[in-house]
Structure formats: structure tokens, C-alpha cells
Amino acid sequence: GNLTVAVVLPLANTSYPWSWARVGPAVELALARVKARPDLLPGWTVRTVLGSSENALGVCSDTAAPLAAVDLKWEHNPAAFLGPGCVYAAAPVGRFTAHWRVPLLTAGAPALGFGVKDEYALTTRAGPSYAKLGDFVAALHRRLGWERQALMLYAYRPGDEEHCFFLVEGLFMRVRDRLNITVDHLEFAEDDLSHYTRLLRTMPRKGRVIYICSSPDAFRTLMLLALEAGLCGEDYVFFHLDIFGQSLQGGQGPAPRRPWERGDGQDVSARQAFQAAKIITYKEPDNPEYLEFLKQLKHLAREQFNFTMEDGLVNTIPASFHDGLLLYIQAVTETLAHGGTVTDGENITQRMWNRSFQGVTGYLKIDSSGDRETDFSLWDMDPETGAFRVVLNYNGTSQELVAVSGRKLNWPLGYPPPDIPKCGFDNEDPACNQDHLSTLE
Amino acid sequence: GNLTVAVVLPLANTSYPWSWARVGPAVELALARVKARPDLLPGWTVRTVLGSSENALGVCSDTAAPLAAVDLKWEHNPAAFLGPGCVYAAAPVGRFTAHWRVPLLTAGAPALGFGVKDEYALTTRAGPSYAKLGDFVAALHRRLGWERQALMLYAYRPGDEEHCFFLVEGLFMRVRDRLNITVDHLEFAEDDLSHYTRLLRTMPRKGRVIYICSSPDAFRTLMLLALEAGLCGEDYVFFHLDIFGQSLQGGQGPAPRRPWERGDGQDVSARQAFQAAKIITYKEPDNPEYLEFLKQLKHLAREQFNFTMEDGLVNTIPASFHDGLLLYIQAVTETLAHGGTVTDGENITQRMWNRSFQGVTGYLKIDSSGDRETDFSLWDMDPETGAFRVVLNYNGTSQELVAVSGRKLNWPLGYPPPDIPKCGFDNEDPACNQDHLSTLE
């Protein structure tokens, strides 16, 4: 028989991690693997039908995507949907597919809302999600003794689909649930200095452990301004939520990662400021299959999709689509073996959830509500060379922090700064005031 | 032939102005009128097919509505859509119908966004819209000499679909465009006293001419608190944006409208506070056809829809659906007469736009971008009786303010208070400081 998978992803714009130019080759490789494995869907052909989630400007759209989904449903009655990746595109499509009782599989749609499976029934996320970032940060706080206060800043940039809003939303909600700590969150516009200066006035009163989601340039600007304002000392720690490692120039290999460096007159100051910075990214899979997959992926992208794929963590997304599609096909195979049909979306989905799977991205665990456990890396500066390197990894499945041997977090004080200063944010601790008075007597 | 109109409105919940229990009888009356008129669609049958814009809880839904629209499109390929009315339901449906090039006709969807016909192509609004409220308020400001500053407050109430947000958005944007004045807008939660107290602290610094969108009870509470804080004197004017006249208990007839009255211990204070209040509503049509239509509407609602319709401005919405549907059918008739077809959505829509029409709601003018010109009434207190009555009407077509003979606006000072106090909000006018200093010498 024929198994039809309807794809709703950006078909023209190649800049999204889930653009078809990136995911298409991964899907091809997955389907080639299915063909080569007699235990997967024997006697069946898997075919993909394509619809675009972009509008005429090539931007993800909450109109184009559901319209594409509707057209594909009408014309092809697919067994499953692959994508969308963009939050605003995925939301209506996921609600439609839930109504149609058709599985939706994506390695995008990382926002918190998609974890609510009453609304997004049969949606499986084989890629990373922002609430899982909250699990990592909560584990980090426990490890470092920060159980009282944190500050989260997120940049608004026109046309970036509010990536940072959704990231901080997922992080904020999950950290608050896990730790029961006070978390403040503030938005700022990357292209207006007054937003930075207002943040710098707020920081001393609101936090010492500060998470920032922004572009690499905005993070560097904020660090330079913080240094200028005297907020980059040993009492503060700034985590750049740079999940795809843009500021580290992505890529494999031994090139030094110097996110503070621009080859301009501010490099010396920036390096100094970045002593107080750490960077959080997704974890690059380190299994040999992943490297082999990347080679094939790049080759196929160039040959069949006329697209040159750069190195970097962004490639974990096509890889996750690949693994998710294989997991789905595995679940369909099992459903058929148990007398079900390819249209039995509930049964197929249940076989994907609460399950682990060995994929090109390594060990993949889908949790009991259909979301992948996500691994993260924490990068810190080597004070000798100024290069950032991974000092700690987080295993989403075991929820453990794993130190990289021979490396440790760099703290100017020798230990993590407290999340609330010794005397409180406003020097309100009576004991401190008492000390202060006694020196005057 | 058959002309199919697909309805997407709340089918179960009767509380919306555009609930099917209210609009259904209006549609029946319109279709009866079409049958009775040989010049309208001769030889054609108009039939309606129904889909619900509500979710399982009976609440308007941005998922249920487009899904209903999709199902109706698949099954019936309608020539036009009627509804939705709710903003969040109408948005995806209007974008879908624009993509399908099918006319959408509604007397709801009053938010600013639906005026952007690039996105909502072929959407005609035969009912009132919030930007038109801005035209009225701009005309009022010009008349009263308020061309510098205004303050707009809007209540957030869980489950009311952000009615006040959208109302103030349309008002704010249009007033700002028309007058080039400074307009501040602030949200408050109706059920949190701290929000009221914060507003009262802000008011003296931000405005003297204040627009408030909220429930009648919240408006009364705010007025009582303002009185208590000394902000209800002659220097302030508070406009309650009560578009359906809820606080005036709707209804025909000579019953005194006393929005300050609750029969509680606060009535005396409330009456005093409401000296500084005015109320803005839609204008009740005063043509005899409207009264006749209401009689038939109520009868049909009771007989065929098992629903008892109350009096009030809310009935202008079903009446507007009635007139809009007749206008659509007129446009289809003309299109057919000119050799077009019922599927020629563009042509039909163009015949509805920039056109006037005599309906049960009186003289109806659709502007050049498909939105009805809207009439408003301004109510003020008769200081003798404490009853509110219409003192001024606004004609949307002519954009004129028309005083009701023998009535005038009641100003404690004898004239409208200035929109910026004589010495500025922070007493910053140097001339005033000069005076002030001289009294100290």
C-alpha cells in the first residue's frame, strides 16, 4: 500500500532550521533507510506530498500553513503530517490535525504550548523544546545552589517570530514549576540603547543570575555596557541562551570559539566582560552515526536540493526529523503487525510516546506526552586562551549534569556568586545595616 | 440555481450578539424578503449551511471556526460565508476565505485588523467597527477643542475575548491618525483593586479626558474611587465606552436610564461621581422599519429558535446581518445580470463596497474598503433627574455630530475641561511656576 506523509514546511526560504532544503535531504535519507530495511513497512511505499508554511514573502505564516494543511488533507488524505516548525505556523496546523485525529510529527514547534496535548493531540516533537531547557536550568540551579532568584531577559527583533519570547516562556514556566523560585522576565528591543540602559538599571535590583536570549551581537553589546556600568564583576553571571550556538560559529573542529571577538576596537573589553558570561546551547550529538549522517545530508542537500549546508547545531533539527520519521514508520509497522491500519493515528502515536530509540542523533527518548528529552551543553571561557568550551553537559533522559573531564566552571570568586546578594538586592538585610552602623560608632 | 451561504457562528451559546439564535431569525427574515421580491435572484434558491464557531465549552474558538469553515467549503463549496463575529474566530476564517476568493460577510469582527483588506480580501463588515468609533471620538475632540492629549483605559476580563482590548486598539489607532494627539492607553484587571488604585495614581499625570472600556460595574467602581480620590471634579471627564448600552439597561421606552444606580449604599456618591461621566453607545436606529423588524425578529426567535430576545442595542447586530445579507443578494443579482456567476467573489464584493442601501437599520453606507459607516450616540446626565439621555448623535456617513434639540452637554465648569491642565500635568509650565514664585515673595 501507499503511506502518504504530508509535509508543511518552508519550501522556498532556506534560513529556517526546518526549511525543506535542510529537512528534505534528511527525509530522503530516512526513506532510503526504510527501503533498505525489510523489517520496516514491508510491501509499502512511503511518499511525501509538499505544502508550504510560508507566505509570499517567504516568512512562516499562521495562514499559509493551515491552508496548505487543509489542501493536502483534501487532496491526499495523508496518514501523517511532518512539520510545521515555526511556532505560529505549527499552532493552527496542530489544532487542525488534532481535530482530524491525524498524527503530526515535527522537530520544531518548540514553544511551551505544544506540550499541552489536550489541544495538540497526536503531536509528537522529535526535536528540542523550550520547557526541556527549563529542566536543564533547574538542574543547574540545584547544582549551584541558586534556589531563590533569577532574571530572564529576552530580545524582541522584528521578523524573528518572537523566538526569544517563546524560549523564555518555556524556560520561565518550567524553572518556576521545578524550583519554586522568584523569576523576573523582561523584554528589550535589540536596536534601542534605552532598552539596554533600563535593563542595566534594573539588574542590580532584580538579579545576579541572569539569562539572556538575544542575537550574539546584542549579547555582546549588553556585556560591554554591563562592564561599563560595573556589573560584570564577580557578583554577576550572564547566561547567553544561544541554543544553536550561533555565537560560537557552530561548526565542528578545533577552531577557537571566541564569542566576544569581532576584530574591532572593543575586543579587549569584550573579552574582559565575557569572564562573567556562560553560553547554553543544544548538545551536539557525539556518536559516529551523526557525523556520517551529516556527510550524507550535506551531499544530498547540494546534489538534489541545490543547497550548501553549513556546519553547526542547526543540523540537529533535520537529523531529528530523520529520527522522528523513522520512529513514526516503526510505530506504523508495529500497528499494522497488530492488525491496525495506517489511519489509526491514536494507536500509532501511543507507540511513539514514552519510548526510546537509537537514531542518528544518538539515544532518543520521547517522553510520556510525546516530547523528546533534550540534551544541552554549558560553555564557559578558558581564562587563559579566551576560548569558550563545553564544561558541562545535561542528559535530558537521566536529567543529570555531566562534567567534561578536566574542565570546570570558571568563577572569579572561586565559587558561584549567590543568586541574592549577601545583604539583599536593596541592602535590606537588617544584619548588614547593623554592621554598617557599628562601624560608625 | 442554488446559492449556498455557509454560516459560521455560535450555534449553541446564545450570549453573543451574533449567536445563531439571534442571527438565524434575521437571516430567515432576509430570505423571506428575497422570496417576496421578484427582482432579487429570480429563479434561484438561497440555502444556508451551518457550522459552529464555538468549541466544546460553547466559547468562540480560533480552531473550531476555521475547521467549520474548511468542512463547509469541502462539503458545500458555498458562494459566500456569513460570520464569524468573534474576533479570534473571524481572523483565521477571513484569511481562509480570502485565499479561497470567497466573499465573507459579517456584522461582527469589529477589530481594527479586519480593515486591512490585503489580508482580509472580500470581507465585508455590515456592522459596526471599532475604528469607526475612532472617527466619532476624533470628531468629538475637534468639536470640544481637545487636540492634545487623551487617556484610554481598558479592562481585561477572563473569557470576554479581549473585547475591550480590541475596542481601544481601534479607537486609539484611528484617533491618533485623525488628530495627531498624544494618547496613552492602560490595561487593568476588573477584579483587582490594586489595578484601580494604580490607575487613579496615573490619571492626574496622564489625562483629563479619559475613555474607559469596562463592564458597567467596573466603571461605577472606578468612578466611586475617583470621587473618593478627588478626581471627579470639573477638571475631568470620563467616557464609558459602553457600545451596547448595557449600563443603560438597553430597552425602548421612557424608563429613566440611571447607570449609577444599584439600590445600594453607594448610589448617592455614584450619582455625584457620574456628573463627570458620559456614555458612548452605538446609535439605536430610529426608523419605523427597525421597530417592525424587531417585532418580527423576536417572534421568530421565540417560535423557531426557542429563544427569548431582550430589548437593547445588541439587536442592531442581527439587524445588520439581515441588511448585509440583502445587500449581498442584491450584488449577486446585479453580477448575474451582467453575465457574471455566483462564484465571482471579486465582482460581487466590489458591488457591495462604496455603496449605500436602505435597510431595516436605516440608511446603510459601506465604505470604499468594505466597512460600514457607523453611527454613535453620546449620553449625558440630566443634572436635575440624574437620568442619562442622548445629547448628541454622530452620523458616520456624513461624519457629523448632530445635537439632540433642547439638550446640551453638561459641564460643571460651564465649558469642557481642557485636555491638558492649565499648568501642565506636572505643573511644568514655566509661567505657572513664575506665578507660584511671586506669591512667595
Epitope: D192, L193, S194, T197, E228, G265, Q266 | -
Partner: antibody
Framework: EVQLVESGGGVVRPGGSLRLSCAAS????????MSWVRQIPGKGLEWISG????????YYADSMKGRITISRDNAKNSLYLQMNSLRAEDTALYHC????????????WGQGTLVTVSS | DIQMTQSPSSLSASVGDRVTITCRAS??????LAWFQQKPGKAPKSLIY???SLQSGVPSKFSGSGSGTDFTLTISSLQPEDFATYYC?????????FGQGTKLEIK
């Protein structure tokens, strides 16, 4: 609407002093850096002084260092430039400019106030 | 101090032409470069910041590019109102420095 209005220019003898003022509206000067830029009639633009958002950093061009002082009064939302020991070559139109260092640069300019140094 | 060298110093062009002005910094300034337009008797007006971002309200016929030390300003289709003097300026490091200007004249 952002507006910058300079005042205090005029004719002064060599060796004399002037205090230029800049009244800002539409934004708070303590949220931004502020700079002074001058232009000799018919010539190019020359940045002469800047103050950062919190007043903690002050910068001067070598050409005027030691002869000028930049300051700010947040309460009055104003910027000042005290100029001493003026020379004929300081004759120029002096612009007050909003300064978004590392973000948008010098984004809003006043029309300028003319300083003429002549005996 | 960082020297900014602009070329050409003057340029004659016709309405409808596409013109390019270049600016070179004596040391790396990443993308901290702005372009200004000045008309006689008026204050300079900011066109572009961060080498390629348009200030709000500036028409899209203006575009900028470059990073490090070499930058260009392009006007895609000259209109009569575009004839003016254009300056580049680095805002990476104090003291800020300007190019000497390019006078764009009608041919």
C-alpha cells in the same frame, strides 16, 4: 517625537567662553548617550565630545581636550557643553546628537547652534 | 584614532542612476558603521546603522553593506531629492570619526 534644540551660540572673542545647551524632548537623556558634533561652515563633520547613558564615561576629541566640559542635567532633560579658551578655528555649527553607542549610533540630530569666534 | 576614508569625494550622476559610495576604516570596526545624508543648511540625517540596517522612515532604495574595514552605501535609483552630501561614521570606539564626505551632484 524626538527633538533636540540647541542654544547658547553666538559671537565670542578669542580666549572667551560659551556654554551651549541642548533641550531634549520625546525621550529621556539618561536612557541614552549624548554627543556634540561640530561642522565648520562648508566643511565636514567632527565629533568633539560624548557622555554615556549613566554619566560614568566622558569622552573628548583631542582637538578640544582640556578646553571643553560636557555635562547633563537629567531633571531638565538637557545636555550642556562648556567651552573655554575659544579659538578662531572653533567657529562652527555645534550639533547636539543622541548617541546609541554600539546600537544605532548617532541617530537624532539637533539643527545646531552657531558659534563664531572673532575679534 | 580610527581614520575613515570615503571615496569618491564627489560624484556626478543622473536621476534613475544607481550609485555606490565606499568607506574604509583604518582598523576593524565590525559593523559599527553609520551613513548620513546632509543637505545644505540642514542637520545630517541618519540613513543606515550597523552597516546595513535602515533607520526607520528611510526608503529602501538606500542600502548598506560591509563589515570589518570596507563598507559601501548604494542608492538604487536616484531621485532629485537624493542629491546631497553623504558621510560615513564609525561608532565602535571613541573618539567617533567621520569620513570626509561625498558630494553627490546632478550631472
Amino acid at each position: 517625537e524626538v527633538q533636540l534644540v540647541e542654544s547658547g551660540g553666538g559671537v565670542v572673542r578669542p580666549g572667551g567662553s560659551l556654554r551651549l545647551s541642548c533641550a531634549a524632548s520625546g525621550f529621556n537623556v539618561d536612557d541614552y548617550g549624548m554627543s556634540w558634533v561640530r561642522q565648520i561652515p562648508g566643511k565636514g563633520l567632527e565629533w568633539i565630545s560624548g557622555i554615556n547613558w549613566n554619566g560614568g564615561r566622558i569622552y573628548y576629541a583631542d582637538s578640544m581636550k582640556g578646553r571643553i566640559t560636557i555635562s547633563r542635567d537629567n531633571a531638565k532633560n538637557s545636555l550642556y557643553l562648556q567651552m573655554n579658551s575659544l579659538r578662531a578655528e572653533d567657529t562652527a555649527l555645534y550639533h547636539c546628537v543622541r548617541d546609541q553607542w554600539l546600537v544605532r549610533g548617532l541617530d537624532y540630530w539637533g539643527q545646531g547652534t552657531l558659534v563664531t569666534v572673532s575679534s | 584614532d580610527i581614520q575613515m576614508t570615503q571615496s569618491p569625494s564627489s560624484l556626478s550622476a543622473s536621476v534613475g542612476d544607481r550609485v555606490t559610495i565606499t568607506c574604509r576604516a583604518s582598523q576593524g570596526i565590525y559593523n559599527y558603521l553609520a551613513w548620513f545624508q546632509q543637505k545644505p543648511g540642514k542637520a545630517p540625517k541618519s540613513l543606515i546603522y550597523a552597516a546595513s540596517s535602515l533607520q526607520s522612515g528611510v526608503p529602501s532604495k538606500f542600502s548598506g553593506s560591509g563589515s570589518g574595514t570596507d563598507f559601501t552605501l548604494t542608492i538604487s535609483s536616484l531621485q532629485p531629492e537624493d542629491f546631497a552630501t553623504y558621510y560615513c561614521q564609525q561608532y565602535n570606539t571613541y573618539p567617533y570619526t567621520f569620513g570626509q564626505g561625498t558630494k553627490l551632484e546632478i550631472k
